[in-house]
């Protein structure tokens, strides 16, 4: 015998209290698949979270973060403070990248400058706190007496935007 609940579409639930008829999900709840016996409570985007997509009867709300913060975790389960380019977030707040490392985003960690010689290349543009080096041709490709290193381009906001 076919389960009568299997006929209940997304946006409804199979109501045991009413002879298993399909009832619409109550306000602030949803069911994203058919045949559900309950509707799920909608996520609420509060505090540092803001609503990216409203809850509907068939899909949950989606949150992102207020300006100055960025999402972490699946489905933006957390918001983390932005830092400036050239910094990383530590337990004590935003700290400048150490020499030889950079961060060209408002999130994430300071990473070591690329080691151009790993690929047999030279450094074309020096790194800064806000920018990685730019690797250039291999030293053998450079004409004798030619300088291989260009000073770094001036750092500018917004640089790599937070994702």
């Amino acid at each position: 015998l076919q389960d009568p609940c299997s006929n209940c579409p997304a946006g409804t639930f199979c109501d045991n209290n009413r002879n298993q008829i399909c009832s619409p999900c109550p306000p602030n709840s949803f069911s994203s698949a058919g045949g559900q016996r309950t509707c799920d409570i909608c996520r609420q985007c509060k505090g540092v979270f803001r609503t990216r997509k409203e809850c509907s009867s068939t899909s949950n709300a989606e949150c992102d973060c207020t300006p100055g913060f960025h999402c972490l975790g699946a489905g933006c389960s957390m918001c983390e403070q932005d830092c400036k380019q050239g910094q990383e977030l530590t337990k004590k707040g935003c700290k400048d990248c150490c020499f030889g490392t950079f961060n060209d985003q408002k999130r994430g960690i300071c990473r070591p400058w690329t080691n151009c010689s790993l690929d047999g290349k030279s450094v074309l543009v020096n790194g800064t706190k806000e920018r990685d080096v730019v690797c250039g041709p291999s030293p053998a490709d450079l004409s004798p007496g030619a300088s291989s290193v260009t000073p770094p381009a001036p750092a500018r906001e917004p640089g790599h935007s937070p994702q």
Epitope: D104, Q105, G108, I109, R111, T114, N115, C116, L118, D119, K121, L124, V125, D132, V133, V134, C135, G136, A153, P154, R156, P158, G159, H160, S161, Q163
Partner: antibody, heavy 119, light 107 residues
Framework: QVQLVQSGAEVKKPGASVKVSCKAS????????INWVRQAPGQGLEWAGN????????NYNQKFKDKATITADKSTSTAYMELSSLRSEDTAVYYC????????????WGQGTTVTVSS | DIQMTQSPSSLSASVGDRVTITCQAS??????LNWYQQKPDKTVKLLIY???RARSGVPSRFSGSGSGTDFTFTISSLQPEDIATYFC?????????FGQGTKLEIK
């Protein structure tokens, strides 16, 4: 030499998912960013996102945030892009690329993987 | 997102001609501008990076120049094997963005 070899063409039904792979060789996989770029039929190139295989740090184009999941397996030097809830608009050639020695340019490109979404 | 406006969208030129393609960024991207060649078989190759640096092995007829928002890609003497579509791309700010492409044909 540096090479990126992608998985073969895929035909999928709307609503399905697909996982495209990109096997890297000829360099230290963990030291360079892998990018994914989409090209719809007759269209230009669109950057979807990238991953730094050393720590699996990812960046996404907001447009692909709910569509694509980029991962990397260091043990096999392979990067992946999984596309979910496929629609006809996702029909495209997907390329993986490797950076030139900092994230700002893409020096090596895979041969491309054609994903066709059709009922 | 940074918009990259590339022109022309297509052009037809004769072997030996000097060909110029321009790319304009919607905001300052310093020198983080790259040029790619996509052959009819869909293979893609980086030709020029950081505005004007040719990758090793790229013929000297290919060059690039510019800074800030306005950039130029030049083929000094067009060869039959240069039939391709050429794209500019900014690497300054995420998300990376490409120009619409210039399809180059031989007269």
């Amino acid at each position: 030499q540096v090479q990126l070899v992608q998985s073969g063409a895929e035909v999928k039904k709307p609503g399905a998912s697909v996982k495209v792979s990109c096997k890297a060789s000829g360099y230290t996989f963990t030291s360079y960013w892998i990018n994914w770029v989409r090209q719809a039929p007759g269209q230009g190139l669109e950057w979807a996102g990238n991953i730094y295989p050393s720590d699996s740090y990812t960046n996404y184009n907001q447009k692909f945030k709910d569509k694509a999941t980029i991962t990397a397996d260091k043990s096999t030097s392979t990067a992946y892009m999984e596309l979910s809830s496929l629609r006809s608009e996702d029909t495209a050639v997907y390329y993986c690329t490797r950076d030139y020695g900092s994230a700002y340019s893409m020096s090596t490109w895979g041969q491309g993987t054609t994903v066709t979404v059709s009922s | 997102d940074i918009q990259m406006t590339q022109s022309p969208s297509s052009l037809s030129a004769s072997v030996g001609d000097r060909v110029t393609i321009t790319c304009q960024a919607s905001q300052d991207i310093s020198n983080y501008l790259n040029w790619y060649q996509q052959k009819p078989d869909k293979t893609v190759k980086l030709l020029i990076y950081y505005t004007g640096r040719a990758r090793s092995g790229v013929p000297s007829r290919f060059s690039g120049s510019g800074s800030g928002t306005d950039f130029t890609f030049t083929i000094s003497s067009l060869q039959p094997e240069d039939i391709a579509t050429y794209f500019c791309q900014q690497g300054d700010t995420l998300p990376y963005t490409f120009g619409q492409g210039t399809k180059l044909e031989i007269k």
